[in-house]
């Protein structure tokens, strides 16, 4: 019987470092090895018939035990499939190796209204583009961490908001007077130093009533 396997199905490596993606196989007399890269809608062939393809040949080397990168970039993050077949035969096996290229978060950008109307919906956003894996976000009001559920802490029990740590969106609905304050957010992805945005003050103002 044929086997195709990797003892490292997930590899995490800091950007600009070398890395090897392992693929061990047995039971093939004349193995033909191919490596495919998948990331979202993108699919690329890295290795075809035991040879690295032109788009990778300057930085990837084929070895009988896997493929080795001289230096990885964030664009290399994705799933690599090692596919082994018998030349001229019908034996086939494959194994997937997930590569996560680690990049620390950059300073997050916030979108916070300087004033918002009490009783209305107010949307605050926080995002950063560099972090790999993608960052999770924590919001602060006046330097205090905002819990995901406002009712869980006395300090925020009068607030009504929904906080999404994955998207970085903070939605007040409805906004109350006590939501006035200085807001900032922190991005962290478990690699490198967490980064904090600038703090921006939001005033919760009464609705203008026409005379």
């Amino acid at each position: 019987s044929v086997t195709v396997h990797s003892s490292e199905p997930e590899v995490r490596i800091p950007e600009n470092n070398p890395v090897k993606l392992s693929c061990a196989y047995s039971g093939f007399s004349s193995p033909r090895v191919e490596w495919k890269f998948d990331q979202g809608d993108t699919t690329r062939l890295v290795c075809y018939n035991n040879k690295i393809t032109a788009s990778y040949e300057d930085r990837v080397t084929f070895l009988p035990t896997g493929i080795t990168f001289k230096s990885v970039t964030r664009e290399d993050t994705g799933t690599y499939t090692c596919m082994v077949s018998e030349e001229g035969g019908n034996s086939y096996g494959e194994v997937k190796v997930k590569l996560i290229v680690l990049v620390p978060p950059s300073k997050p950008t916030v979108n916070i209204p300087s004033s918002a109307t009490i009783g209305n919906r107010a949307v605050l956003t926080c995002s950063e583009q560099d972090g790999s894996p993608p960052s999770e976000y924590t919001w602060f009001k006046d330097g205090i961490v905002m819990p995901t559920n406002p009712k869980s802490t006395r300090a925020f029990s009068n607030s009504s908001y929904v906080l999404n740590p994955t998207t970085g969106e903070l939605v007040f609905d409805p906004l109350s007077a006590s939501d006035t304050g200085e807001y900032s957010c922190e991005a962290r992805n478990g690699y490198g130093t967490p980064m904090t945005s600038n703090a921006v003050r939001m005033e919760a103002v009464e609705r203008n009533v026409g005379v």
Partner: antibody, heavy 116, light 106 residues
């Protein structure tokens, strides 16, 4: 035939560092990752980390991260394992082992004794 | 991390006995287990890989079996040269050894 020959026994004081070598022959050194495994007296074998000699890429066990450094010299087909901030619990036999998927060939082992 | 629990810790047997050593993984390891023999002051020696594939030169009295989380090394008829310590290794996801089984003369 494949051979892995390690350096001789070492006696070190707590806080010091030790560097053990492993010279490979009988195969293409850059084709296979080289791992280090240790065995403290009466204990199970414990995986420490490895190096891909082709590009110098390393991976370490979380337990040893920050204290172990594995390097390779392709010109002499030699892998090295350096362990720093030694303590008495680091007294063990240290092995290098070639990886196919499992470990198929091992060095003879190097006894490192940490004693004040 | 995958944990490997090997049993028994030690066993006493006589020449000609049938000996069984087991290894239990903390999760399914998809048959990616190897067995090593180690004699005093020597390096471990690969005996079996991928559950049941005998390494070249290993006597046929050694066999391996199992699936999922439970695996077994069997020596059908113990010989004098088989007295040693045996270790299992899972290599499905990184590498973890069992604690070893010492096979002693009764």
């Amino acid at each position: 035939q494949v051979q892995l020959v390690q350096s001789g026994a070492e006696v070190k004081k707590p806080g010091a560092s030790v560097k053990v070598s492993c010279k490979a022959s009988g195969y293409s050194f850059t084709d296979y990752s080289m791992h280090w495994v240790r065995q403290a007296p009466g204990q199970r074998l414990e995986w420490m980390g490895y190096i891909d000699p082709y590009n110098g890429g390393t991976r370490y066990s979380q337990k040893f991260q920050g204290r172990v450094t594995i390097t390779a010299d392709t010109s002499t087909s030699t892998a090295y394992m350096e362990l720093s901030s030694l303590r008495s619990e680091d007294t063990a036999v240290y092995y290098c082992a070639r990886q196919t998927d499992y470990f198929d060939y091992w060095g003879q082992g190097t006894l490192v004794t940490v004693s004040s | 991390a995958i944990r490997m629990t090997q049993s028994p810790f030690s066993l006493s047997a006589s020449v000609g006995d049938r000996v069984t050593i087991t290894c239990k993984a903390s999760q399914d390891i998809n048959n990616y287990i190897a067995w090593y023999q180690q004699k005093p002051a020597k390096a471990p020696k690969l005996f079996i890989h991928y559950t049941s594939t005998l390494q070249s030169g290993v006597p046929s009295r050694f066999s391996g079996s199992g699936s999922g989380t439970d695996y077994t090394l069997t020596i059908s008829s113990l010989q004098p040269e088989d007295f040693a310590t045996y270790y299992c290794l899972q290599y499905d996801n990184l590498w973890t050894f069992g604690q070893g089984t010492k096979v002693e003369i009764k």
